[in-house]
Amino acid sequence: QQQTLPKPFIWAEPHFMVPKEKQVTICCQGNYGAVEYQLHFEGSLFAVDRPKPPERINKVKFYIPDMNSRMAGQYSCIYRVGELWSEPSNLLDLVVTEMYDTPTLSVHPGPEVISGEKVTFYCRLDTATSMFLLLKEGRSSHVQRGYGKVQAEFPLGPVTTAHRGTYRCFGSYNNHAWSFPSEPVKLLVTGDIENTSLAPEDPTFPADTWGTYLLTTETGLQKDHALWDHTAQNLLR
């Protein structure tokens, strides 16, 4: 006999990285017929929603109108059908950005390189932080973490066309409080390759949609938000 229901999906819209004072919605998708959803923050009950009518709703939204460092942290949700509770969702790491300062991102040997060339990004921030994060724009969240007193090195190693795209970096004051994003750096990888199988390019968003992460299909939603959850967990723990 089943003692718990399947865990719900949790994600943030438009993104898990939220500029301070901006709004964010935490979404929790369980099952039709769920009579109650609970949102937990840092292990404690944060909010409750009881959808009406439950048999026609399988998703609830928890709205945060004004993001700040107190609201940043780890969220999870659970739902109940009758007396039976679900497993808790994966943890969602909600990050507040645009704190304090703006780092500088550079890439060596340059923003245009040849396939196979070794590339290193440098993220520099003169204020007190020792953790830096490099992110590539696009559906799949390519995130690297680096450390240094005022600058972190992010070696990409020999690059392929899959590394093409727009990169930004952040300084991190703690796991859930990040600086303003750096100016974007677009990496262009050129090169005619013979007898080499390369990874396909990642779909990337135009620079002006940075920070918006909108998906249309429920399947895509579930898959990609699970990916975001997974990325956030790996990144922030």
């Epitope: 340059g110 040849i114 396939s115 196979g116 060339e117 070794k118 392929t160 005619d192």
Partner: antibody, heavy 116, light 107 residues
Framework: QVQLVQSGAEVKKPGSSVKVSCKAS????????MHWVRQAPGQGLEWIGG????????SYNQKFKGRATITADKSTSTAYMELSSLRSEDTAVYYC?????????WGQGTTVTVSS | EIVMTQSPATLSVSPGERATLSCRAS??????LHWYQQKPGQAPRLLIK???QSISGIPARFSGSGSGTDFTLTISSLEPEDFAVYYC?????????FGQGTKLEIK
């Protein structure tokens, strides 16, 4: 110490080809791209193209695409630049240069003279 | 392609004096600008990378500055061996391009 040693001077007829070599030592050959730059007599520097020896990725100046072929042999740590359909304007000193961000090390240069 | 323009074409300065060489890019190249020195019959030699970063083994009298489109190479006090041709190079975008050179001659 890093050294790039190029092959000797060449005299070629118009319409023919020349292949210049550049043997690298003192560093891991596959970790840096190798580029070719030429300098006509009394003129400035002109980039021809470059290669990433580890997977053979190349990039060319459009001006030379189709005429220049850059290759690399990892087993001998040697890069090559072949230029075909030579004309008198190709008379120049040809340099190989390692790209460590900038061109941090250069070969001694190979003089190619194209004359009928 | 990014066009690099150096000025002046020739600069006449006395030993011991300061020399200032300019390089302008046709579009912004951030700090992806490198400086080289070339003497007759020799290969170019790297002096400054990324606009202002010094190179091991290069005398401290050589310094670079600038960002975006305008760059400067300064030689604080000229030595006899500094009289040569100087080139700037765009390291930002392919094709990699060089300025036409500034010839530094003894006044």
């Amino acid at each position: 110490q890093v050294q790039l040693v190029q092959s000797g001077a060449e005299v070629k007829k118009p319409g023919s080809s020349v292949k210049v070599s550049c043997k690298a030592s003192g560093y891991t050959f596959s970790e840096y791209t190798m580029h070719w730059v030429r300098q006509a007599p009394g003129q400035g520097l002109e980039w021809i193209g470059g290669i990433s020896p580890n997977i053979g990725g190349t990039s060319y100046n459009q001006k030379f695409k189709g005429r220049a072929t850059i290759t690399a042999d990892k087993s001998t740590s040697t890069a090559y630049m072949e230029l075909s359909s030579l004309r008198s304007e190709d008379t120049a000193v040809y340099y190989c240069a390692r790209r460590g961000g900038s061109f941090d090390y250069w070969g001694q240069g190979t003089t190619v003279t194209v004359s009928s | 392609e990014i066009v690099m323009t150096q000025s002046p074409a020739t600069l006449s300065v006395s030993p011991g004096e300061r020399a200032t060489l300019s390089c302008r890019a046709s579009q912004s190249i951030s700090d992806y600008l490198h400086w080289y020195q070339q003497k007759p019959g020799q290969a170019p030699r790297l002096l400054i990378k990324y606009a202002s970063q010094s190179i091991s083994g290069i005398p401290a009298r050589f310094s670079g500055s600038g960002s975006g489109t305008d760059f400067t190479l300064t030689i604080s006090s000229l030595e006899p061996e500094d009289f040569a041709v100087y080139y700037c190079q765009n390291g930002h975008s392919f094709p990699l391009t060089f300025g036409q050179g500034t010839k530094l001659e003894i006044k």
